[in-house]
C-alpha cells in the first residue's frame, strides 16, 4: 500500500517551489493539462549556456514524513537532447541531481539551508533514458522518463526535496512522494494494523477480531516488509468465541442465528439446535431446553435435551414361598437417553392391616436400584404379608425433573406359613416286611399340624412308580409290605392350615432278614 505525501498531479494551485539563485534561466513553473483535462503543474529549466559552476536549484515545500522511515520519489520528466539545441555549449547536460534535507519544521528560507551538498543529502544523479529531440519549427518528440528514488532513513518531522540543474534543458512533469506501508490485514480472524515499516522487516502483533478469542499457542504475529507487503507466514491466529462462527473468508465472526448454536470456541460453524431445545437470541453458545426437557451435568453442551422415561410396563410377579421374582417391560418412552435404569420402592402390610415401608430383612438381587436389567428377585418375604412394589424407570435427567416419578405398581400377598421340614426320623421297630417310624412334632408358626405325609421308596428304585405315600395324623407311622432285608429312603412333611411344609431330609432304614429276629426297636 502506498501513502502519498505529495503528488503534484493533484495540485490545482501554484506549487511555488523555491528556486536559487534569483537569476535568469532559472526553473520556472508552468501549467498544462493531464489526460482528464485537469490542470497540472510542471517545472522546466533550460540554461544550456550557463556560466561554469552555476547551478539552478529547485526545492519543494516542506513535506511531513508522517512516520515514514523511507520515502520514495517518483519523478516524471522529459530531457531535451543537447544535440537538438543549436545554442548548447559544452556545459549542456542530460542529467540532474536530486537531494533532500530533513528538518523538524518548515524552517527553510530562500537562502537557508545553504544550497549545496551537506547540508543537503544527495539521493542520486538522474540520467534520462529517453531524450527528447526538437527540430526548429517542429514539435518536440520523445518519451517521458519515469524514475523512482528512495530517500532515507528519515528521522525528523519532515523534509524538503531539491533538484539541482547544471545545464540541462528539461521539464519536471510530476513528482510523487510516497511511502510504503503494510495495509491493515485480517487473516485467520486476526487483525493486523496498518503498519509503516521502520526496518527491512518489522514484526507486528495481531489482535483478535470482535467476538474472536486467541487460539492456544504463541500470540499471532506477521512481518511487515519494507516494500509494504506482509511476509507470508503461518498464523496461529484466533478463533470465533462460543456462539459465533467464521464468516467473510475468515475475516470476521458472525453471531449464530436464532435456532442455531456453537458451544465451543474454535473452528466449525453454528449448528441447528439439538432435539428438544431452542435459542431465541443470536450468538447462542448453548440452546435452552424446552419445558420438561433437561441436560444432565455430564451431557455435552451440544447434546439433545432429554426427559425422564415413562413408567415400566407389564410387571409380572412369580411368588415362590418367601421369594418373589419380578419382571417387567421397558417403558414406552425412554426420554431420548441410553442410560436407563430401574428402581423399586416397597411397602408391606401386616395381616392386621398396618402398613409401612419394607423392613431391612428383605434382600433384592441384584439390588433395589440402579438396575440395568428389567428384573429383580426379592427374598425374605414374610408369610401372610401383602407387599406393594412400585417399579420406576430412571435416566440421567430424572433427578432434574420436578413432580412425581411415574411407576408401575404390583401387589403380592404371601401365603400363610407352612410347617417346617420334618427331620430326626427314628425307626422304632423293624421286621422283614415293615418299619415303624417316629419323629418330633415340628413347631408350626401358623396353627397346629393337622397331619403328616410320609414318602418312601426302595433304595435304587428311583422311578415315580416306585414311590409310595402314607398319611398319618400322629407323629409316627408304620410302613408295611416291604421287602425282606431291603434298604428304604423315607421323607416326611407336615401339613397345617397354611398347607404342606417341605419334605425333610431322606432317612435311610432297612428291613430285617428273617422272622426269627422278631420286632426289634431301633434307636436312630
Amino acid at each position: 500500500l502506498e501513502e502519498t505525501l505529495l503528488n503534484t498531479k493533484l495540485e490545482t494551485a501554484d506549487l511555488k517551489w523555491v528556486t536559487f539563485p534569483q537569476v535568469d534561466g532559472q526553473w520556472e513553473e508552468l501549467s498544462g493539462l493531464d489526460e482528464e483535462q485537469h490542470s497540472v503543474r510542471t517545472y522546466e529549466v533550460c540554461d544550456v549556456q550557463r556560466a561554469p559552476g552555476q547551478a539552478h536549484w529547485l526545492r519543494t515545500g516542506w513535506v511531513p514524513r508522517r512516520g515514514a522511515v523511507h520515502v520514495y520519489a517518483t519523478l516524471r520528466f522529459t530531457m531535451l537532447e543537447c544535440l537538438s539545441l543549436p545554442r548548447a555549449g559544452r556545459s549542456c547536460k542530460e542529467t540532474f541531481t536530486v537531494f533532500y534535507y530533513e528538518s523538524d519544521a518548515d524552517t527553510a528560507t530562500a537562502l537557508t539551508p545553504a544550497w549545496m551538498e551537506n547540508p543537503y543529502i544527495k539521493v542520486d544523479t538522474v540520467a534520462a533514458e529517453h531524450l527528447t529531440r526538437k527540430r526548429p519549427g517542429a514539435e518536440a518528440t520523445g518519451k517521458v522518463n519515469v524514475k523512482t528514488l528512495r530517500l532515507g532513513p528519515l528521522s525528523k518531522a519532515g523534509f524538503y526535496l531539491a533538484f539541482q540543474d547544471q545545464g540541462a534543458c528539461m521539464a519536471l512533469l510530476s513528482l510523487h512522494l510516497f511511502y510504503k506501508k503494510c495495509a491493515q490485514l485480517t487473516v485467520n480472524l486476526t487483525r493486523f494494523p496498518e503498519t509503516v515499516p521502520r526496518e527491512l522487516v518489522v514484526p507486528v502483533a495481531g489482535s483478535c477480531v470482535v467476538d474472536a478469542v486467541p487460539a492456544p499457542g504463541p500470540s499471532p504475529s506477521l512481518y511487515c516488509r519494507e516494500d509494504g507487503q506482509w511476509a507470508e507466514q503461518p498464523v496461529t491466529g484466533c478463533s470465533c468465541a462460543p456462539g459465533f462462527e467464521a464468516a467473510e473468508g475468515n475475516t470476521k465472526c458472525r453471531a449464530c442465528a436464532q435456532g442455531t448454536f456453537k458451544p465451543l470456541s474454535g473452528e466449525g460453524s453454528c449448528q441447528p439446535c439439538p432435539a428438544n431445545s431452542h435459542s431465541n437470541t443470536i450468538g447462542s453458545a448453548v440452546c435452552q431446553c424446552r419445558v420438561g426437557y433437561f441436560r444432565a451435568r455430564t451431557d455435552p453442551r451440544g447434546a439433545p435435551c432429554t426427559t425422564p422415561p415413562s413408567a415400566p410396563r407389564s410387571v409380572v410377579s412369580r411368588l415362590n414361598g418367601s421369594s418373589l421374582h419380578l419382571e417387567w417391560s421397558a417403558p414406552l418412552e425412554s426420554g431420548g437417553r441410553e442410560d436407563l435404569t430401574y428402581a423399586l420402592r416397597c411397602r408391606e402390610c401386616r395381616p392386621g392391616g398396618s402398613c409401612a415401608p419394607c423392613g431391612g430383612d428383605l434382600t433384592f438381587d441384584p439390588g433395589p436400584r440402579d438396575l440395568v436389567e428389567p428384573w429383580v428377585v426379592v427374598r425374605g418375604l414374610r408369610p401372610d404379608f401383602t407387599y406393594t412394589f412400585e417399579v420406576t424407570a430412571l435416566n440421567g435427567v430424572s433427578s432434574l425433573a420436578t413432580g412425581p416419578v411415574p411407576f408401575e405398581p404390583v401387589n403380592v400377598t404371601t401365603d400363610r406359613e407352612v410347617p417346617p421340614a420334618v427331620s430326626d426320623i427314628r425307626v422304632t421297630r423293624s421286621s422283614p416286611s415293615s418299619l415303624s417310624l417316629a419323629w418330633a412334632v415340628p413347631r408350626a408358626p401358623s396353627g397346629a399340624v393337622l397331619d403328616y405325609e410320609v414318602k418312601y421308596h426302595e433304595k435304587g428304585a428311583e422311578g415315580p412308580s416306585s414311590v409310595r405315600f402314607l398319611k398319618t395324623s400322629e407323629n409316627r407311622a408304620e410302613l408295611r409290605g416291604l421287602k425282606r432285608g431291603a434298604s428304604y429312603l423315607v421323607q416326611v412333611r407336615a401339613r397345617s392350615e397354611a398347607g404342606y411344609g417341605p419334605f425333610g431330609q431322606e432317612h435311610h432304614s432297612q428291613t430285617q432278614l428273617d422272622e426269627s429276629e422278631g420286632w426289634r426297636e431301633q434307636l436312630a
Epitope: 494551485a13 501549467s31 498544462g32 533550460c46 518536440a140 534543458c169
Partner: antibody
Framework: QVELVESGGGLVQPGGSLRLSCAAS????????MSWVRQAPGKGLEWVSA????????SYADSVKGRFTISRDNSKNTLYLQMNSLRAEDTAVYYC???????????????????WGQGTLVTVSS | DIELTQPPSVSVAPGQTARISCSGD??????VHWYQQKPGQAPVLVIY???KRPSGIPERFSGSNSGNTATLTISGTQAEDEADYYC???????????FGGGTKLTVL
Amino acid sequence: QVELVESGGGLVQPGGSLRLSCAASGFTFNNAWMSWVRQAPGKGLEWVSAINAKGQFTSYADSVKGRFTISRDNSKNTLYLQMNSLRAEDTAVYYCARKGMSFYNNKYAKSMFDLWGQGTLVTVSS
Amino acid sequence: DIELTQPPSVSVAPGQTARISCSGDNLGKKYVHWYQQKPGQAPVLVIYYDSKRPSGIPERFSGSNSGNTATLTISGTQAEDEADYYCQAWGAGSHQMVFGGGTKLTVL
C-alpha cells in the same frame, strides 16, 4: 517581428454576432497557449477565454460562457473569438494575448501574458 | 474564485519609491504577475512570478509576494512610469485568469 494583430471589431446591435481574429507572427504559434482579454471603456482588464496550443482545450470566464467560442487555426497562425448574443456590457477593447511559452513542450505554458496585441474595439449598441 | 484588490490610485513624487499593493486571500501561495498599461496602448508585462523581470524592463521595477499581499515596487519613479498597473493571478477554474481592478500611478 514578434507581434499579435487583432481585427474584426466594430459596431453591432445587442443580440448580434461578431468574429474577432488575431494574426500571430514572429514565433511558433502552434506552440503557444493563447487568450482573449477585454477592457471596457475606462475600466480594468478582464480575462475572457483561453485555448491550448493544439486547440483541443478551451476555458471561459463565467460572463461569456455559452455565448463566446475561442478557436484557432495553427496552419494560418490565427486565433479567433466568435461572439454571439452580444450585450451592451460586452462593449470593450478586445486584446489577444500569448501566455508565456515552454522551451519545447507545447502541452504546458506559463501563467503570465508576455505578448499582447494592440486590441480591437467592439461596440454593442442599438 | 479569488478576488484581487488594488488601490484605485497611488501618487508618487519623481525619484521616490512607489508601492502598489494587490491583496487577496492567501495570495502569497499564488504567483502574481504585473502589467503596465499606458493610455491607448496594450498592457505590457513588467513583473512575472512575483519578482522576475522580463528582458527590457528597467531594474527599478521589482516585486514581492507574501501572506495576503503582493507588492509592485518602483524605486526612483520616473515620469514615464505614469500608467495603470494591473496584478494578475490564477483563478479557481481550470486555466482561468483573474486581474486586479487596476491602480492609476500618478507621478507628481
